[in-house]
């Protein structure tokens, strides 16, 4: 069962089991009321581990369009603009929830899906394996 | 009208308007079939812009637990372990979709919500504003 005290104004549900089918209002509420001034969209160019953004579109998914990061270099960019291959540019990945149309092409029926997306890149010290 | 060639096996929907309420199966399908060996969980320590992970829990949200990154330093860590304040550690943020119980405490009724989460940190060259 679900661990939440029931609100008497809740919609009825035929299936009380978990996993279960729920009603979701797709009118997205935006918690980020104001544009965050510290949220820069040019980090991908200014980072020592810069990345490019690749467009991934799937009409059977909600959201249909996801922009994915791909690190530009294996190494990290130094102050002089050259790449330091003693360091590694690596993607920072996150598992996010998306909705997948199920059955396919159905406008009002979805299944939750977990996908792994690369959000940006960071510069890390490599793990060095010493051979005995 | 709704923008998808209708599959005859789709559930009925009373409201065809946009925005609309849809059915979602919460039995999560995981697209990431195998654990990605390159998806390292120690980047937060090995990065030149290391971060700590903070647990954010909200029982009215699905998923109820989200881990948020907070950069450890204003500057970036150099090879000698000291912090270089001529560079900046900045959070890489992403807007993600979550489900918010609506009305509150209802187990089977949600609304999509967009929230901004910090996934990790990257080291960037600062923007220098020159005063004339």
């Amino acid at each position: 069962g679900i661990a939440i005290p029931r609100n008497s104004g809740c919609p009825n549900s035929e299936d009380k089991n978990f996993p279960r089918t729920v009603m979701v209002n797709l009118n997205i509420h935006n918690r980020n009321t104001s544009t965050n001034p510290k949220r820069s969209s040019d980090y991908y160019n200014r980072s020592t581990s810069p990345w490019n953004l690749h467009r991934n579109e799937d009409p059977e998914r909600y959201p249909s369009v996801i922009w994915e990061a791909k690190c530009r270099h294996l190494g990290c960019v130094k102050a002089d603009g050259n790449v330091d291959y003693h360091m590694n540019s690596v993607p920072i990945q996150q598992e996010i929830l998306v909705l997948r149309r199920e059955p396919r092409h159905c406008p009002n029926s979805f299944r939750l899906e977990k996908i792994l997306v690369s959000v940006g890149c960071t510069c890390v010290t490599p793990i060095v394996h010493h051979v005995a | 009208g709704i923008a998808i060639p209708r599959n005859s096996g789709c559930p009925n929907s009373e409201d065809k308007n946009f925005p609309r309420t849809v059915m979602v199966n919460l039995n999560i399908h995981n697209r990431n079939t195998s654990t990605n060996p390159k998806r390292s969980s120690d980047y937060y320590n090995r990065s030149t812009s290391p971060w700590n992970l903070h647990r954010n829990e909200d029982p009215e949200r699905y998923p109820s637990v989200i881990w948020e990154a907070k950069c450890r330093h204003l500057g970036c860590v150099k090879a000698d372990g000291n912090v270089d304040y001529h560079m900046n550690s900045v959070p890489i943020q992403q807007e993600i979709l979550v489900l918010r119980r609506e009305p509150r405490h209802c187990p089977n009724s949600f609304r999509l919500e967009k929230i901004l989460v910090s996934v990790g940190c990257t080291c960037v060259t600062p923007i220098v504003h020159h005063v004339a």
């Epitope: 997205i28 953004l53 467009r55 369009v65 922009w67 | 923008a3 060639p5």
Partner: antibody, heavy 121, light 106 residues
Amino acid sequence: EVQLVQSGAEVKKPGSSVKVSCKASGYTFTDYEIHWVRQAPGQGLEWIGVNDPESGGTFYNQKFDGRATLTADKSTSTAYMELSSLRSEDTAVYYCTRYYRYESFYGMDYWGQGTTVTVSS
Amino acid sequence: EIVLTQSPDFQSVTPKEKVTITCSASSSISYIYWFQQKPDQSPKRWIYATFELASGVPSRFSGSGSGTDYTLTINSLEAEDAATYYCHQRSSYPWTFGQGTKLEIK
């Protein structure tokens, strides 16, 4: 009311650059990508590329890659298209149009009024 | 690049007549989109995702097709339908448009 209002007509010399703006209002700017399409006099429509104001991502029709630069300013809900190394064949009406990121089935639903760019020596 | 070929290029039609515009794709695509454009105006989204009429589009219009062959049909042409119609695909980059079909009222 959703509106995409573009900057005024431009006359440019060959080899120079032009920057067209597209100010959006009446919706959440970052929920939609901005696509750019052009139409040469008496001709059909040609897709230039896309900018995602949310992530800063861009993707171009290869024909324009390297010459077109698409940007957006979230603080003013304005998208920009800059085209460099102009030649006479770039004389066209340039349109911005929005595209819903969450449900792409809706396609390009609202268009700007168009900006005429004339390239002439 | 996927080439969209519309037929006919031009059609002069009498009011109340049925009109069919076809759009043939050089490779299979998922959906087709149709835009209407009148002289000195921006294109208007007319039919989206092959079948769906955009808001305000009269019900005399319909869209159909799959794979490589798509159709826009006007059941009973009216004077206000005089315009150029473009088909559009976004299944493959670069996104492309048909050359347009100009409808004229006799």
